[in-house]
């Protein structure tokens, strides 16, 4: 593919990403699918810098990012390394509660009210933010 | 709640054309990814094409491509399959899918001379 | 292209069986994978998504596990409203493709 130089229609540029902030909310997996679908990822937040610019544009709101411990450890779906990276959680989190009575515990991270970062059950349908990096290949196909 | 309502099929001669439409409501919209799909009289269910929330990127099955034209207007909450050339092969109900979360009822597209 | 395929084609079952349904993908497909059930003149409705999570409002008898290339969908105690057949859909990468569906009924 060619490389993308420009953030899509409906895209906000920042600092070489583009991220894009959905208006309603789906599941942890099905936010996922989507901006896998629209070739990037679920936001992966690794500066204070960018933390500050995705809470401003989410507001006080529950929303996704692209951080879960589904498999055990947490990671990023980029790959971003989570041990040596940026992180936010509220006090006391993450803490993987069982007490919800939907099954399981708390395998997905999201951005708080406050923008802190809580694991939720995956199956909430919280809003979700999608990045891609400008510079990198577009895997997107013509209009066939 | 979420309704995808489908309409605009019929009965339609070979090589004749045909416009479905998806409405939708109960949805954000433009938050979703949408597909068409269908489904022969007694057959399996077929993917038929996909078109991103923008609709800056589609995808057809390869035995449609050029004959199926998908689009979505996001302003009116809808989506579209403009089918040209029809075939007897075609004669399926057609189903709109947000995602590949909600489904619509179908609508029956039968082309037969 | 990625090919499904669906085991059994068909089985007959009484209320109250456990059934379980197999989907193999002709390569790895991660957990892009989800099961929907069609009852006779009706839309499908999605069942299981990511392979393993209980759509909303779906009963719990339905479960969902797998994940690359081999993935099942089991009914714990089937119920007469569960008759019907049941599809499993990649959508990993384009185009997405349905299994060949399994059609459960009354033994």
């Known amino acids: 593919g060619s490389e993308r130089t420009c953030c899509p229609v409906n895209w906000v540029e920042h600092e070489r990403s583009c991220y894009w902030f959905s208006r309603s909310g789906k599941a942890w997996a099905d936010a996922d699918n989507y901006c896998r679908l629209e070739d990037a990822h679920l936001v992966v937040v690794t500066s204070w810098e960018e933390q500050k610019f995705v809470q401003h544009h989410i507001g006080p709101v529950n929303t996704w990012m692209g951080l879960h411990d589904q498999n055990g450890p947490w990671k990023w779906v980029d790959g971003t390394d989570y041990e040596t990276g940026f992180k936010n959680w509220r006090p006391e989190q993450p803490d993987d509660w069982y007490g919800h009575g939907l099954g399981g515990g708390e395998d997905c991270a999201h951005f708080t009210d406050d923008g802190r970062w809580n694991d939720d059950v995956c199956q909430r349908p919280y809003r979700w933010v999608c990045e891609t990096e400008l510079d990198k290949a577009s895997q997107e196909p013509p209009l066939l | 709640q979420v309704q995808l309502v489908e309409s605009g099929g019929g009965l339609v001669k070979p090589g004749g054309s045909l416009r479905l439409s998806c409405a939708a409501s109960?949805?954000?919209?433009?938050?979703?990814?949408m597909n068409w799909i269908r489904q022969a009289p007694g057959k399996g269910l077929e993917w038929v094409s996909y078109?991103?929330?923008?609709?800056?990127?589609?995808f057809y099955a390869d035995s449609l491509k050029g004959r199926f034209t998908i689009s979505r207007d996001n302003a009116k909450n809808s989506l579209y399959l403009q089918m040209n050339s029809l075939r007897a092969e075609d004669t399926a109900v057609y189903y709109c899918?947000?995602?590949?979360?909600?489904w619509g009822q179908g609508t029956l597209v039968t082309v037969s001379s | 292209d990625i090919q499904m395929t669906q085991s059994p084609s068909s089985l007959s079952a009484s209320v109250g069986d456990r059934v379980t349904i197999t989907c193999r993908a002709s390569q790895g497909i991660r957990n892009d994978l989800g099961w929907h059930q069609q009852k006779p003149g009706k839309a499908p409705k999605r069942l299981i998504y990511?392979?393993?999570s209980l759509q909303s409002g779906v009963p719990s008898r339905f479960s969902g596990s797998g994940s690359g290339t081999e993935f099942t969908l089991s009914i714990s105690s089937l119920q007469p409203e569960d008759f019907a057949t049941y599809y499993c859909l990649q959508h990993n990468s384009f185009p997405f493709t349905f299994g060949p569906g399994t059609k459960v009924d009354i033994k």
């Open positions: 899918a947000a995602d590949t979360i909600y």
């Open positions: 078109i991103s929330s923008s609709g800056r990127t589609i």
């Open positions: 990511a392979a393993s």
């Open positions: 109960g949805i954000t919209f433009s938050d979703y990814y």
